[in-house]
């Protein structure tokens, strides 16, 4: 015998209290597939979360983060504070990248500058705390019309190159 509940479409649930007829999901709940015996409670985007997509009878609400924060985890399960470029988030808040490291994003950690010599290349542009080193072409790559590799100017202060 076919389960009568299998006829209940998304946005409804199979109501055991009413002879298994299909009842619409109550307010603030949803069912994203057919044949459900209950509707799920809609996610509420509160506090540092804000609503990106409202809940409907067939799909859950989606949250993102308020300005100054960014999403982490599947489905934006957490919001983490933004930092400025050239910084990383620590337990004590946003801290500047140490000399020799950079972060070009508002999230994540400071990473060491690229070591150009690992690829047999030289430094074309110095790194800063906001930007990675740029590696120049290896001598074999140079051809007419390509930039010649000029030695980098010494940095005027830790983590910064002259602009």
């Amino acid at each position: 015998l076919q389960d009568p509940c299998s006829n209940c479409p998304a946005g409804t649930f199979c109501d055991n209290n009413r002879n298994q007829i299909c009842s619409p999901c109550p307010p603030n709940s949803f069912s994203s597939a057919g044949g459900q015996r209950t509707c799920d409670i809609c996610r509420q985007c509160k506090g540092v979360f804000r609503t990106r997509k409202e809940c409907s009878s067939t799909s859950n609400a989606e949250c993102d983060c308020t300005p100054g924060f960014h999403c982490l985890g599947a489905g934006c399960s957490m919001c983490e504070q933004d930092c400025k470029q050239g910084q990383e988030l620590t337990k004590k808040g946003c801290k500047d990248c140490c000399f020799g490291t950079f972060n070009d994003q508002k999230r994540g950690i400071c990473r060491p500058w690229t070591n150009c010599s690992l690829d047999g290349k030289s430094v074309l542009v110095n790194g800063t705390k906001e930007r990675d080193v740029v590696c120049g072409p290896s001598p074999a790559d140079l051809s007419p019309g390509a930039s010649s590799v000029t030695p980098p100017a010494p940095a005027r202060e830790p983590g910064h190159s002259p602009q």
Epitope: H70, K84, Q85, G86, F102, D104, Q105, K106, R107, R111, P112, W113, T114, N115, L118, D119, L124, V125, T128, E130, R131, D132, V134, C135, S147
Partner: antibody, heavy 127, light 111 residues
């Protein structure tokens, strides 16, 4: 020689979906950031999304966030763009672009620009 | 409305020099590398300048890039008819967590 070949474009109704593919050859696909960039007829270039090869991190333009998903299959040397809830303003030529700066040696590709481009695939959104 | 501002058009006569500007802010051009692209009519863009001022192999030294503060410039000297194209600046914008393009400058070579 770097070659990028986009496919999957076509006519779709507003609210519909399309999946674009970009077949890459001539370079070590798994070592480079890859982007999708679009251009509506007679309009500017607009960056859509980027995916990193090392950590799989993805970033999107605000105009497509929550509707488009970029992905890659390094074993097939292929880049994808899944486009859902399409709107009239999504109609454009979609280019697949390879970034310079091979990873993991290079930590950030942003300095090197997009040094390889496909010829594009046209997406039309109309009822 | 693009985050990076370029003049919509520029022109020059063969042999002359033309400069195209690109203006942004501290979250993009000010702290990040600028790249320039050339798009000939009906074709895909081509990388012209990377890391503010460096040319990829094969790009003639008639093309040069520079940057000061939150603005960048592309200069083309010894203009040729084949330089007639759209030119786009681009960079990473950390506050948007994404790449941004200018809206392009259409270069016309007169005469």
């Amino acid at each position: 020689e770097v070659q990028l070949l986009e496919s999957g474009g076509g006519l779709v109704q507003p609210g519909g979906s399309l999946r674009l593919s970009c077949a890459a050859s001539g370079f070590t696909f798994s070592g480079y950031d890859m982007s999708w960039v679009r251009q509506a007829p007679g309009k500017c270039l607009e960056w859509v999304s980027v995916i990193y090869p090392d950590d799989g991190n993805t970033y999107y333009a605000d105009s497509v966030k929550g509707r488009f998903t970029i992905s890659r299959d390094n074993s097939k040397n292929t880049l994808y763009l899944q486009m859902n809830s399409l709107r009239a303003e999504d109609a454009a030529v979609y280019y697949c672009a390879k970034h310079g700066g091979q990873k993991p040696t290079t930590k950030s590709s942003s300095a090197y620009g997009m040094d390889g481009w496909g010829q594009g695939t046209l997406v039309t959104v109309s009822s | 409305q693009s985050v990076l501002t370029q003049p919509p058009s520029a022109s020059g006569t063969p042999g002359r020099r033309v400069t195209i500007s690109c203006s942004g802010s501290s979250s993009n051009i000010g702290n990040n590398y600028v790249t320039w692209y050339q798009q000939l009519p009906g074709t895909a863009p081509k990388l012209l300048i990377y890391a503010d001022s460096h040319r990829p192999s094969g790009v003639p030294d008639r093309f040069s890039g520079s940057k000061s503060g939150t603005s960048a410039s592309l200069a083309i000297s010894g203009l040729r008819s084949e330089d007639e194209a759209d030119y786009y600046c681009a960079t990473w914008d950390y506050s948007l967590s994404g790449y941004v393009f200018g809206c392009g400058t259409k270069l016309t070579v007169l005469g």
